[in-house]
Protein backbone atom coordinates (compact mmCIF):
# COMPACT_ATOMS: atom_id res chain seq x y z
CA UNK A 1 0.00 0.00 0.00
CA UNK A 2 1.30 3.42 -0.96
CA UNK A 3 0.64 6.11 1.62
CA UNK A 4 -0.05 9.77 0.88
CA UNK A 5 3.58 10.83 1.19
CA UNK A 6 4.41 9.11 -2.11
CA UNK A 7 2.11 11.32 -4.12
CA UNK A 8 3.89 13.41 -6.73
CA UNK A 9 1.88 15.86 -8.80
CA UNK A 10 3.59 16.75 -12.04
CA UNK A 11 2.10 19.96 -13.46
CA UNK A 12 0.65 20.02 -16.92
CA UNK A 13 3.01 20.73 -19.80
CA UNK A 14 2.09 21.40 -23.40
CA UNK A 15 3.48 20.19 -26.69
CA UNK A 16 2.53 20.98 -30.28
CA UNK A 17 2.25 18.21 -32.84
CA UNK A 18 1.74 18.96 -36.52
CA UNK A 19 0.09 16.32 -38.64
CA UNK A 20 -0.79 16.01 -42.31
CA UNK A 21 -4.29 15.22 -43.48
CA UNK A 22 -4.93 11.45 -43.74
CA UNK A 23 -1.52 10.56 -42.33
CA UNK A 24 -0.76 8.87 -39.00
CA UNK A 25 0.73 10.77 -36.08
CA UNK A 26 1.92 10.20 -32.52
CA UNK A 27 0.73 12.31 -29.59
CA UNK A 28 3.64 12.10 -27.12
CA UNK A 29 3.31 11.47 -23.39
CA UNK A 30 5.79 10.01 -20.96
CA UNK A 31 5.83 9.32 -17.23
CA UNK A 32 7.99 7.81 -14.54
CA UNK A 33 7.40 4.09 -14.62
CA UNK A 34 5.28 2.63 -11.84
CA UNK A 35 2.71 -0.01 -11.04
CA UNK A 36 -1.03 0.11 -11.75
CA UNK A 37 -0.77 2.37 -14.76
CA UNK A 38 -3.93 4.13 -15.86
CA UNK A 39 -3.91 6.18 -19.08
CA UNK A 40 -6.78 8.37 -20.25
CA UNK A 41 -6.54 10.42 -23.43
CA UNK A 42 -9.26 13.05 -23.87
CA UNK A 43 -10.04 15.60 -26.57
CA UNK A 44 -10.99 19.17 -25.58
CA UNK A 45 -11.50 17.91 -22.00
CA UNK A 46 -14.72 16.20 -23.05
CA UNK A 47 -14.45 13.44 -25.62
CA UNK A 48 -12.93 10.13 -24.60
CA UNK A 49 -10.21 9.20 -27.05
CA UNK A 50 -8.50 6.22 -25.42
CA UNK A 51 -8.50 4.53 -22.01
CA UNK A 52 -6.12 1.93 -20.64
CA UNK A 53 -6.13 0.46 -17.15
CA UNK A 54 -5.80 -2.84 -15.33
CA UNK A 55 -3.40 -3.93 -18.06
CA UNK A 56 -5.66 -3.51 -21.09
CA UNK A 57 -7.62 -1.07 -23.25
CA UNK A 58 -11.13 -0.10 -22.18
CA UNK A 59 -12.78 1.52 -25.16
CA UNK A 60 -16.46 1.00 -24.33
CA UNK A 61 -17.02 4.72 -23.81
CA UNK A 62 -14.64 5.87 -26.57
CA UNK A 63 -16.11 8.59 -28.76
CA UNK A 64 -17.15 7.00 -32.09
CA UNK A 65 -14.97 9.36 -34.12
CA UNK A 66 -11.86 7.64 -32.69
CA UNK A 67 -13.01 4.05 -33.25
CA UNK A 68 -10.24 1.91 -34.77
CA UNK A 69 -7.97 4.94 -35.04
CA UNK A 70 -6.07 4.92 -31.74
CA UNK A 71 -3.66 2.63 -29.97
CA UNK A 72 -0.90 2.79 -27.38
CA UNK A 73 2.62 1.40 -27.50
CA UNK A 74 1.70 -1.51 -25.27
CA UNK A 75 5.18 -3.00 -24.96
CA UNK A 76 6.53 0.36 -23.82
CA UNK A 77 3.96 1.34 -21.20
CA UNK A 78 5.97 -0.32 -18.44
CA UNK A 79 8.90 1.86 -19.55
CA UNK A 80 6.93 5.07 -19.10
CA UNK A 81 5.57 5.57 -22.62
CA UNK A 82 1.92 6.68 -22.71
CA UNK A 83 2.06 8.11 -26.25
CA UNK A 84 -0.97 7.69 -28.47
CA UNK A 85 -0.70 6.40 -32.02
CA UNK A 86 -3.37 8.18 -34.03
CA UNK A 87 -4.37 6.99 -37.50
CA UNK A 88 -5.58 9.03 -40.49
CA UNK A 89 -5.89 12.48 -38.94
CA UNK A 90 -8.50 14.87 -40.30
CA UNK A 91 -8.92 18.60 -39.86
CA UNK A 92 -11.73 17.86 -37.41
CA UNK A 93 -9.12 16.25 -35.15
CA UNK A 94 -7.38 19.58 -34.56
CA UNK A 95 -7.43 20.75 -30.95
CA UNK A 96 -6.14 20.05 -27.47
CA UNK A 97 -5.61 16.50 -26.24
CA UNK A 98 -5.04 15.78 -22.56
CA UNK A 99 -3.28 12.69 -21.32
CA UNK A 100 -3.86 11.63 -17.71
CA UNK A 101 -1.37 9.04 -16.49
CA UNK A 102 -1.73 7.74 -12.97
CA UNK A 103 0.29 5.10 -11.17
CA UNK A 104 0.11 3.88 -7.59
CA UNK A 105 2.46 6.66 -6.53
CA UNK A 106 2.17 9.54 -8.98
CA UNK A 107 0.14 11.34 -11.60
CA UNK A 108 1.02 13.45 -14.58
CA UNK A 109 -1.13 15.29 -17.08
CA UNK A 110 0.19 16.26 -20.48
CA UNK A 111 -1.45 18.58 -22.98
CA UNK A 112 -0.80 18.06 -26.67
CA UNK A 113 -2.02 20.60 -29.21
CA UNK A 114 -2.67 18.91 -32.53
CA UNK A 115 -2.58 21.05 -35.65
CA UNK A 116 -3.38 19.49 -39.00
CA UNK A 117 -2.18 20.80 -42.35
CA UNK A 118 -3.06 20.00 -45.94
CA UNK A 119 -0.94 20.72 -49.00
CA UNK A 120 -1.91 18.75 -52.09
CA UNK A 121 0.75 19.49 -54.68
CA UNK A 122 -0.07 22.76 -56.44
CA UNK A 123 0.10 23.20 -60.19
CA UNK A 124 1.02 26.03 -62.54
CA UNK A 125 -1.06 26.10 -65.69
CA UNK A 126 -0.73 28.15 -68.86
CA UNK A 127 -4.06 28.95 -70.46
CA UNK A 128 -5.29 30.89 -73.47
CA UNK A 129 -8.66 32.59 -73.07
CA UNK A 130 -9.69 34.17 -76.35
CA UNK A 131 -6.82 36.52 -77.12
CA UNK A 132 -5.51 36.60 -73.56
CA UNK A 133 -2.81 34.44 -72.00
CA UNK A 134 -2.96 33.50 -68.34
CA UNK A 135 -0.70 31.80 -65.87
CA UNK A 136 -2.67 30.13 -63.08
CA UNK A 137 -1.18 28.88 -59.85
CA UNK A 138 -3.64 26.62 -58.11
CA UNK A 139 -3.83 24.23 -55.22
CA UNK A 140 -6.78 21.88 -54.95
CA UNK A 141 -6.66 21.36 -51.21
CA UNK A 142 -4.68 23.40 -48.70
CA UNK A 143 -4.99 24.27 -45.01
CA UNK A 144 -4.43 26.66 -43.38
CA UNK A 145 -4.86 29.45 -45.97
CA UNK A 146 -1.55 29.70 -47.83
CA UNK A 147 0.60 32.70 -48.70
CA UNK A 148 0.78 33.20 -52.48
CA UNK A 149 3.33 35.52 -54.04
CA UNK A 150 4.07 36.34 -57.68
CA UNK A 151 7.27 37.70 -59.16
CA UNK A 152 7.96 39.04 -62.64
CA UNK A 153 11.63 38.88 -63.65
CA UNK A 154 12.43 38.28 -59.95
CA UNK A 155 10.57 41.42 -58.85
CA UNK A 156 7.54 40.95 -56.58
CA UNK A 157 4.18 41.84 -58.13
CA UNK A 158 1.66 43.53 -55.87
CA UNK A 159 -1.46 42.61 -57.84
CA UNK A 160 -2.46 39.16 -56.67
CA UNK A 161 -5.92 37.88 -57.48
CA UNK A 162 -6.98 34.91 -55.42
CA UNK A 163 -10.07 32.85 -56.17
CA UNK A 164 -10.85 30.86 -53.06
CA UNK A 165 -13.42 28.19 -52.34
CA UNK A 166 -13.64 26.70 -48.87
CA UNK A 167 -14.89 23.21 -48.19
CA UNK A 168 -15.56 21.66 -44.80
CA UNK A 169 -11.94 20.86 -44.22
CA UNK A 170 -9.71 22.87 -46.55
CA UNK A 171 -9.38 25.61 -49.14
CA UNK A 172 -9.14 25.31 -52.91
CA UNK A 173 -7.26 28.27 -54.35
CA UNK A 174 -6.62 29.66 -57.84
CA UNK A 175 -4.38 32.64 -58.45
CA UNK A 176 -4.52 33.77 -62.09
CA UNK A 177 -2.16 36.28 -63.69
CA UNK A 178 -2.74 37.89 -67.07
CA UNK A 179 0.54 37.72 -69.01
CA UNK A 180 -0.80 38.68 -72.45
CA UNK A 181 1.96 40.05 -74.68
CA UNK A 182 4.66 39.62 -72.06
CA UNK A 183 8.07 38.04 -72.67
CA UNK A 184 9.04 38.21 -68.99
CA UNK A 185 9.69 35.24 -66.74
CA UNK A 186 7.19 34.67 -63.93
CA UNK A 187 7.38 32.89 -60.63
CA UNK A 188 4.60 31.92 -58.27
CA UNK A 189 5.28 30.70 -54.71
CA UNK A 190 2.71 28.99 -52.50
CA UNK A 191 3.70 28.59 -48.89
CA UNK A 192 2.00 26.54 -46.17
CA UNK A 193 3.39 28.09 -43.00
CA UNK A 194 2.08 25.33 -40.72
CA UNK A 195 3.69 22.48 -42.64
CA UNK A 196 6.70 24.68 -43.46
CA UNK A 197 6.29 23.59 -47.05
CA UNK A 198 6.83 25.78 -50.08
CA UNK A 199 6.05 25.11 -53.71
CA UNK A 200 7.32 27.25 -56.60
CA UNK A 201 6.08 27.51 -60.16
CA UNK A 202 8.31 29.19 -62.74
CA UNK A 203 7.35 30.16 -66.29
CA UNK A 204 9.81 31.18 -68.99
CA UNK A 205 9.00 32.28 -72.54
CA UNK A 206 11.73 31.52 -75.06
CA UNK A 207 12.31 33.53 -78.25
CA UNK A 208 10.13 32.49 -81.17
CA UNK A 209 11.64 30.11 -83.72
CA UNK A 210 11.03 30.32 -87.45
CA UNK A 211 11.49 27.07 -89.34
CA UNK A 212 10.85 25.85 -92.81
CA UNK A 213 8.67 22.92 -93.65
CA UNK A 214 10.49 19.54 -93.57
CA UNK A 215 13.22 20.94 -91.32
CA UNK A 216 13.66 19.83 -87.72
CA UNK A 217 13.55 21.98 -84.62
CA UNK A 218 15.42 21.66 -81.29
CA UNK A 219 13.57 23.05 -78.29
CA UNK A 220 15.55 23.56 -75.11
CA UNK A 221 14.30 22.62 -71.64
CA UNK A 222 16.81 22.75 -68.84
CA UNK A 223 15.72 23.10 -65.20
CA UNK A 224 16.89 26.03 -63.11
CA UNK A 225 19.37 24.77 -60.54
CA UNK A 226 17.75 26.84 -57.77
CA UNK A 227 14.76 24.49 -57.70
CA UNK A 228 15.82 21.31 -59.39
CA UNK A 229 17.06 18.36 -57.40
CA UNK A 230 17.67 15.24 -59.51
CA UNK A 231 17.38 13.04 -56.39
CA UNK A 232 13.72 13.99 -56.02
CA UNK A 233 11.01 12.31 -58.12
CA UNK A 234 9.86 14.48 -60.99
CA UNK A 235 8.00 14.28 -64.27
CA UNK A 236 8.78 16.00 -67.56
CA UNK A 237 6.02 16.55 -70.10
CA UNK A 238 6.30 18.05 -73.56
CA UNK A 239 3.03 19.21 -75.08
CA UNK A 240 1.81 21.27 -78.00
CA UNK A 241 -1.03 23.76 -77.93
CA UNK A 242 -3.61 23.41 -80.66
CA UNK A 243 -6.86 25.42 -80.69
CA UNK A 244 -6.48 26.39 -77.07
CA UNK A 245 -5.78 22.91 -75.68
CA UNK A 246 -2.53 21.06 -75.12
CA UNK A 247 -1.88 17.60 -76.49
CA UNK A 248 0.92 15.57 -74.90
CA UNK A 249 3.82 14.72 -77.21
CA UNK A 250 5.95 12.84 -74.71
CA UNK A 251 6.71 12.45 -71.02
CA UNK A 252 9.45 11.14 -68.79
CA UNK A 253 9.18 9.79 -65.24
CA UNK A 254 12.33 10.06 -63.15
CA UNK A 255 11.23 7.36 -60.70
CA UNK A 256 11.14 4.65 -63.38
CA UNK A 257 13.30 6.50 -65.94
CA UNK A 258 10.56 5.68 -68.42
CA UNK A 259 9.99 7.77 -71.55
CA UNK A 260 6.64 7.58 -73.31
CA UNK A 261 6.47 9.18 -76.78
CA UNK A 262 3.13 9.81 -78.47
CA UNK A 263 4.47 11.59 -81.55
CA UNK A 264 6.69 9.52 -83.84
CA UNK A 265 8.64 12.57 -85.07
CA UNK A 266 9.56 13.52 -81.52
CA UNK A 267 12.94 12.49 -80.12
CA UNK A 268 14.71 12.81 -76.82
CA UNK A 269 18.42 12.40 -76.24
CA UNK A 270 18.93 9.79 -73.51
CA UNK A 271 22.40 11.08 -72.70
CA UNK A 272 21.10 14.61 -72.27
CA UNK A 273 18.29 13.32 -70.04
CA UNK A 274 20.91 11.74 -67.78
CA UNK A 275 22.45 15.19 -67.48
CA UNK A 276 19.02 16.67 -66.58
CA UNK A 277 18.65 18.29 -69.99
CA UNK A 278 15.17 17.62 -71.39
CA UNK A 279 15.55 19.43 -74.69
CA UNK A 280 13.72 17.74 -77.56
CA UNK A 281 13.81 17.45 -81.32
CA UNK A 282 10.84 17.45 -83.64
CA UNK A 283 11.66 16.13 -87.12
CA UNK A 284 10.13 16.69 -90.52
CA UNK A 285 8.13 19.78 -89.63
CA UNK A 286 4.90 20.55 -91.41
CA UNK A 287 2.76 23.67 -91.41
CA UNK A 288 0.37 22.30 -88.75
CA UNK A 289 3.31 22.05 -86.32
CA UNK A 290 3.20 25.82 -85.87
CA UNK A 291 2.17 26.75 -82.36
CA UNK A 292 3.27 26.85 -78.75
CA UNK A 293 5.30 24.05 -77.20
CA UNK A 294 5.35 23.63 -73.47
CA UNK A 295 7.94 21.81 -71.40
CA UNK A 296 6.68 21.07 -67.89
CA UNK A 297 9.08 19.77 -65.24
CA UNK A 298 7.14 19.03 -62.03
CA UNK A 299 7.85 17.61 -58.58
CA UNK A 300 6.21 17.97 -55.18
CA UNK A 301 8.15 21.20 -54.66
CA UNK A 302 8.11 22.96 -58.01
CA UNK A 303 6.77 23.25 -61.54
CA UNK A 304 9.04 24.69 -64.22
CA UNK A 305 7.29 25.70 -67.43
CA UNK A 306 9.17 26.65 -70.57
CA UNK A 307 7.24 27.93 -73.57
CA UNK A 308 8.53 27.93 -77.15
CA UNK A 309 6.68 29.47 -80.07
CA UNK A 310 7.41 27.78 -83.35
CA UNK A 311 6.45 29.22 -86.76
CA UNK A 312 6.69 26.74 -89.60
CA UNK A 313 6.77 28.39 -93.00
CA UNK A 314 6.37 26.78 -96.37
CA UNK A 315 9.64 25.81 -98.02
CA UNK A 316 10.63 27.46 -101.37
CA UNK A 317 9.70 24.29 -103.21
CA UNK A 318 6.23 24.18 -101.71
CA UNK A 319 5.74 27.89 -102.29
CA UNK A 320 6.71 27.65 -106.00
CA UNK A 321 4.35 24.73 -106.54
CA UNK A 322 1.52 27.00 -105.41
Amino acid sequence: IFPLAFFIYVPMNEQIVIGRLDEDIILPSSFERGSEVVIHWKYQDSYKVHSYYKGSDHLESQDPRYANRTSLFYNEIQNGNASLFFRRVSLLDEGIYTCYVGTAIQVITNKVVLKVGVFLTPVMKYEKRNTNSFLICSVLSVYPRPIITWKMDNTPISENNMEETGSLDSFSINSPLNITGSNSSYECTIENSLLKQTWTGRWTMKDGLHKMQSEHVSLSCQPVNDYFSPNQDFKVTWSRMKSGTFSVLAYYLSSSQNTIINESRFSWNKELINQSDFSMNLMDLNLSDSGEYLCNISSDEYTLLTIHTVHVEPSQETASHN
Epitope: F2, L4, F7, S35, S51, G102, V107
Partner: antibody, heavy 123, light 108 residues
Framework: EVQLVESGGGLVQPGRSLRLSCAAS????????MFWVRQAPGKGLEWVSG????????AYADSVKGRFTISRDNAKNSLYLQMNSLRAEDTAVYYC????????????????WGRGTLVTVSS | EIVLTQSPATLSLSPGERATLSCRAS??????LAWYQQKPGQAPRLLIY???NRATGIPARFSGSGSGTDFTLTISSLEPEDFAVYYC??????????FGGGTKVEIK
Protein backbone atom coordinates in the same frame (compact mmCIF):
# COMPACT_ATOMS: atom_id res chain seq x y z
CA GLU B 1 -29.94 2.89 -10.18
CA VAL B 2 -26.54 4.48 -9.54
CA GLN B 3 -26.28 5.08 -5.81
CA LEU B 4 -24.22 4.96 -2.63
CA VAL B 5 -25.81 4.12 0.73
CA GLU B 6 -23.92 4.69 4.01
CA SER B 7 -24.65 2.86 7.24
CA GLY B 8 -23.09 2.25 10.68
CA GLY B 9 -23.40 5.72 12.18
CA GLY B 10 -24.72 6.41 15.64
CA LEU B 11 -23.90 7.70 19.09
CA VAL B 12 -20.57 6.59 20.50
CA GLN B 13 -18.49 7.60 23.51
CA PRO B 14 -15.10 9.29 23.14
CA GLY B 15 -12.26 6.80 22.82
CA ARG B 16 -14.51 4.09 21.39
CA SER B 17 -14.68 2.68 17.87
CA LEU B 18 -17.19 2.59 15.04
CA ARG B 19 -17.22 1.03 11.59
CA LEU B 20 -19.00 2.73 8.73
CA SER B 21 -20.06 0.92 5.57
CA CYS B 22 -21.01 2.15 2.11
CA ALA B 23 -22.90 -0.07 -0.34
CA ALA B 24 -22.46 0.82 -4.02
CA SER B 25 -24.73 -0.11 -6.91
CA UNK B 26 -25.38 0.81 -10.51
CA UNK B 27 -21.74 1.25 -11.59
CA UNK B 28 -18.56 -0.79 -11.87
CA UNK B 29 -17.37 -0.42 -8.30
CA UNK B 30 -13.89 -1.86 -8.82
CA UNK B 31 -13.13 0.68 -11.56
CA UNK B 32 -13.27 3.65 -9.19
CA UNK B 33 -11.40 5.16 -6.29
CA MET B 34 -13.68 5.79 -3.29
CA PHE B 35 -13.62 8.45 -0.61
CA TRP B 36 -15.00 9.47 2.76
CA VAL B 37 -15.93 13.11 3.35
CA ARG B 38 -17.45 14.49 6.54
CA GLN B 39 -19.41 17.55 7.57
CA ALA B 40 -19.67 18.70 11.17
CA PRO B 41 -23.07 20.17 12.11
CA GLY B 42 -23.43 23.63 10.53
CA LYS B 43 -19.90 23.48 9.09
CA GLY B 44 -18.24 22.92 5.73
CA LEU B 45 -17.01 19.79 3.99
CA GLU B 46 -13.80 18.01 5.05
CA TRP B 47 -12.13 15.26 3.08
CA VAL B 48 -11.28 12.32 5.40
CA SER B 49 -9.79 9.46 3.39
CA GLY B 50 -9.49 7.89 -0.07
CA UNK B 51 -8.67 4.49 -1.52
CA UNK B 52 -7.78 3.44 -5.06
CA UNK B 53 -9.72 0.73 -6.90
CA UNK B 54 -7.05 -1.86 -6.03
CA UNK B 55 -6.53 -0.65 -2.43
CA UNK B 56 -2.87 -0.06 -3.29
CA UNK B 57 -3.08 3.71 -2.91
CA UNK B 58 -4.56 5.06 0.30
CA ALA B 59 -4.59 8.57 1.70
CA TYR B 60 -5.78 10.17 4.95
CA ALA B 61 -6.32 13.70 6.21
CA ASP B 62 -3.88 14.65 8.98
CA SER B 63 -6.76 14.96 11.44
CA VAL B 64 -7.58 11.22 11.28
CA LYS B 65 -4.21 9.69 10.41
CA GLY B 66 -3.35 6.78 12.71
CA ARG B 67 -6.93 6.50 14.03
CA PHE B 68 -9.03 5.76 10.95
CA THR B 69 -8.58 2.97 8.42
CA ILE B 70 -10.21 2.87 5.00
CA SER B 71 -10.77 -0.42 3.16
CA ARG B 72 -12.91 -1.90 0.46
CA ASP B 73 -14.28 -5.24 -0.70
CA ASN B 74 -14.73 -5.17 -4.45
CA ALA B 75 -16.50 -8.54 -4.46
CA LYS B 76 -19.19 -7.02 -2.22
CA ASN B 77 -19.21 -3.56 -3.85
CA SER B 78 -18.55 -2.11 -0.41
CA LEU B 79 -16.40 0.60 1.15
CA TYR B 80 -15.56 0.79 4.87
CA LEU B 81 -14.18 3.25 7.36
CA GLN B 82 -12.92 1.84 10.65
CA MET B 83 -12.84 4.70 13.18
CA ASN B 84 -10.88 4.16 16.40
CA SER B 85 -10.10 6.47 19.33
CA LEU B 86 -13.03 8.68 18.44
CA ARG B 87 -13.09 12.28 19.64
CA ALA B 88 -15.86 14.84 20.06
CA GLU B 89 -14.50 16.73 17.04
CA ASP B 90 -15.17 13.65 14.87
CA THR B 91 -18.90 14.32 15.24
CA ALA B 92 -20.23 14.81 11.71
CA VAL B 93 -22.29 13.43 8.88
CA TYR B 94 -20.01 11.01 7.00
CA TYR B 95 -20.48 10.82 3.25
CA CYS B 96 -19.22 8.10 0.93
CA UNK B 97 -18.20 9.46 -2.49
CA UNK B 98 -17.10 7.97 -5.82
CA UNK B 99 -13.97 9.18 -7.65
CA UNK B 100 -14.55 10.63 -11.09
CA UNK B 101 -11.53 9.19 -12.93
CA UNK B 102 -11.93 5.62 -14.07
CA UNK B 103 -9.21 3.55 -12.39
CA UNK B 104 -7.48 6.78 -11.37
CA UNK B 105 -6.92 7.92 -7.81
CA UNK B 106 -5.02 11.19 -8.01
CA UNK B 107 -6.67 14.38 -9.26
CA UNK B 108 -10.14 12.84 -9.10
CA UNK B 109 -13.29 14.72 -8.15
CA UNK B 110 -16.30 13.29 -6.35
CA UNK B 111 -19.05 12.79 -8.89
CA UNK B 112 -21.46 10.65 -6.84
CA TRP B 113 -22.32 11.01 -3.14
CA GLY B 114 -24.35 9.02 -0.67
CA ARG B 115 -26.89 10.70 1.63
CA GLY B 116 -24.56 10.34 4.60
CA THR B 117 -24.66 8.73 8.03
CA LEU B 118 -24.45 10.73 11.25
CA VAL B 119 -21.74 9.91 13.78
CA THR B 120 -22.09 11.56 17.18
CA VAL B 121 -19.21 11.27 19.64
CA SER B 122 -20.35 12.27 23.10
CA SER B 123 -20.19 11.04 26.66
CA GLU C 1 -0.70 23.31 2.78
CA ILE C 2 -3.18 24.65 0.23
CA VAL C 3 -5.99 26.71 1.73
CA LEU C 4 -9.07 27.68 -0.29
CA THR C 5 -10.81 30.91 0.68
CA GLN C 6 -14.33 31.51 -0.62
CA SER C 7 -16.00 34.90 -0.81
CA PRO C 8 -18.39 36.24 0.01
CA ALA C 9 -19.54 34.02 2.87
CA THR C 10 -23.14 34.91 2.05
CA LEU C 11 -24.65 36.29 -1.15
CA SER C 12 -28.19 37.71 -1.01
CA LEU C 13 -29.82 37.86 -4.43
CA SER C 14 -33.20 37.62 -6.11
CA PRO C 15 -34.28 35.02 -8.68
CA GLY C 16 -33.21 36.04 -12.18
CA GLU C 17 -30.11 37.89 -10.93
CA ARG C 18 -26.53 36.92 -11.76
CA ALA C 19 -24.47 35.30 -9.02
CA THR C 20 -20.66 35.51 -8.97
CA LEU C 21 -18.84 33.38 -6.40
CA SER C 22 -15.08 33.53 -5.81
CA CYS C 23 -12.58 30.94 -4.66
CA ARG C 24 -8.93 31.82 -4.03
CA ALA C 25 -6.16 29.26 -3.45
CA SER C 26 -3.14 30.01 -1.26
CA UNK C 27 -0.94 28.57 -4.03
CA UNK C 28 -1.48 27.47 -7.61
CA UNK C 29 -3.73 24.48 -8.19
CA UNK C 30 -3.46 24.77 -12.00
CA UNK C 31 -6.99 24.05 -13.29
CA UNK C 32 -7.68 21.26 -10.82
CA LEU C 33 -10.63 22.85 -9.09
CA ALA C 34 -14.25 21.79 -8.74
CA TRP C 35 -17.46 23.42 -7.56
CA TYR C 36 -20.18 21.59 -5.59
CA GLN C 37 -23.71 22.58 -4.68
CA GLN C 38 -25.30 21.48 -1.41
CA LYS C 39 -28.92 22.03 -0.44
CA PRO C 40 -30.09 21.67 3.19
CA GLY C 41 -30.36 18.03 4.29
CA GLN C 42 -28.86 16.78 1.01
CA ALA C 43 -25.49 15.47 -0.14
CA PRO C 44 -23.28 17.75 -2.24
CA ARG C 45 -23.53 17.55 -6.04
CA LEU C 46 -20.64 18.07 -8.49
CA LEU C 47 -21.32 21.09 -10.73
CA ILE C 48 -18.00 22.03 -12.36
CA TYR C 49 -14.70 20.17 -12.66
CA UNK C 50 -11.29 21.18 -13.99
CA UNK C 51 -12.28 24.80 -13.31
CA UNK C 52 -14.58 25.22 -16.29
CA ASN C 53 -16.18 21.93 -17.37
CA ARG C 54 -19.81 21.31 -16.48
CA ALA C 55 -20.54 17.91 -14.95
CA THR C 56 -23.15 15.67 -16.57
CA GLY C 57 -26.67 17.04 -16.33
CA ILE C 58 -25.68 20.48 -15.03
CA PRO C 59 -27.63 23.36 -16.66
CA ALA C 60 -25.79 25.82 -18.89
CA ARG C 61 -26.51 28.73 -16.53
CA PHE C 62 -23.67 27.39 -14.35
CA SER C 63 -20.18 28.24 -15.59
CA GLY C 64 -16.71 28.17 -14.09
CA SER C 65 -13.56 30.08 -14.96
CA GLY C 66 -10.05 30.76 -13.71
CA SER C 67 -6.76 28.96 -13.24
CA GLY C 68 -3.80 29.09 -10.90
CA THR C 69 -5.08 30.75 -7.74
CA ASP C 70 -8.25 32.66 -8.69
CA PHE C 71 -11.49 30.94 -9.68
CA THR C 72 -15.07 32.04 -10.25
CA LEU C 73 -18.40 30.24 -10.36
CA THR C 74 -21.09 32.18 -12.20
CA ILE C 75 -24.81 31.48 -12.21
CA SER C 76 -26.10 33.61 -15.08
CA SER C 77 -29.71 33.85 -13.94
CA LEU C 78 -30.69 32.42 -10.55
CA GLU C 79 -33.52 29.91 -10.47
CA PRO C 80 -35.38 29.21 -7.19
CA GLU C 81 -33.66 25.81 -6.92
CA ASP C 82 -30.19 27.43 -7.09
CA PHE C 83 -30.37 28.90 -3.57
CA ALA C 84 -27.93 26.67 -1.69
CA VAL C 85 -24.38 26.50 -0.34
CA TYR C 86 -21.56 26.26 -2.88
CA TYR C 87 -18.14 24.76 -2.14
CA CYS C 88 -14.96 24.84 -4.19
CA UNK C 89 -12.49 21.95 -3.98
CA UNK C 90 -8.90 21.52 -5.15
CA UNK C 91 -7.48 18.11 -5.97
CA UNK C 92 -3.86 18.79 -6.89
CA UNK C 93 -2.06 19.79 -3.73
CA UNK C 94 -1.34 18.82 -0.18
CA UNK C 95 -3.61 17.79 1.39
CA UNK C 96 -4.79 16.06 -1.72
CA UNK C 97 -8.45 17.03 -1.49
CA UNK C 98 -9.32 20.35 0.15
CA PHE C 99 -12.63 22.22 0.29
CA GLY C 100 -13.24 25.92 0.69
CA GLY C 101 -15.41 27.19 3.53
CA GLY C 102 -18.45 27.64 1.30
CA THR C 103 -20.63 30.49 0.03
CA LYS C 104 -24.30 30.58 0.91
CA VAL C 105 -26.53 31.97 -1.83
CA GLU C 106 -29.75 33.08 -0.19
CA ILE C 107 -32.94 34.76 -1.38
CA LYS C 108 -32.96 38.50 -0.80
Amino acid sequence: EVQLVESGGGLVQPGRSLRLSCAASGFTFDDHAMFWVRQAPGKGLEWVSGISWSSNSIAYADSVKGRFTISRDNAKNSLYLQMNSLRAEDTAVYYCAKGSIVAGFWLGYFDLWGRGTLVTVSS
Amino acid sequence: EIVLTQSPATLSLSPGERATLSCRASQSVSSYLAWYQQKPGQAPRLLIYDASNRATGIPARFSGSGSGTDFTLTISSLEPEDFAVYYCQQVSGNPLWTFGGGTKVEIK
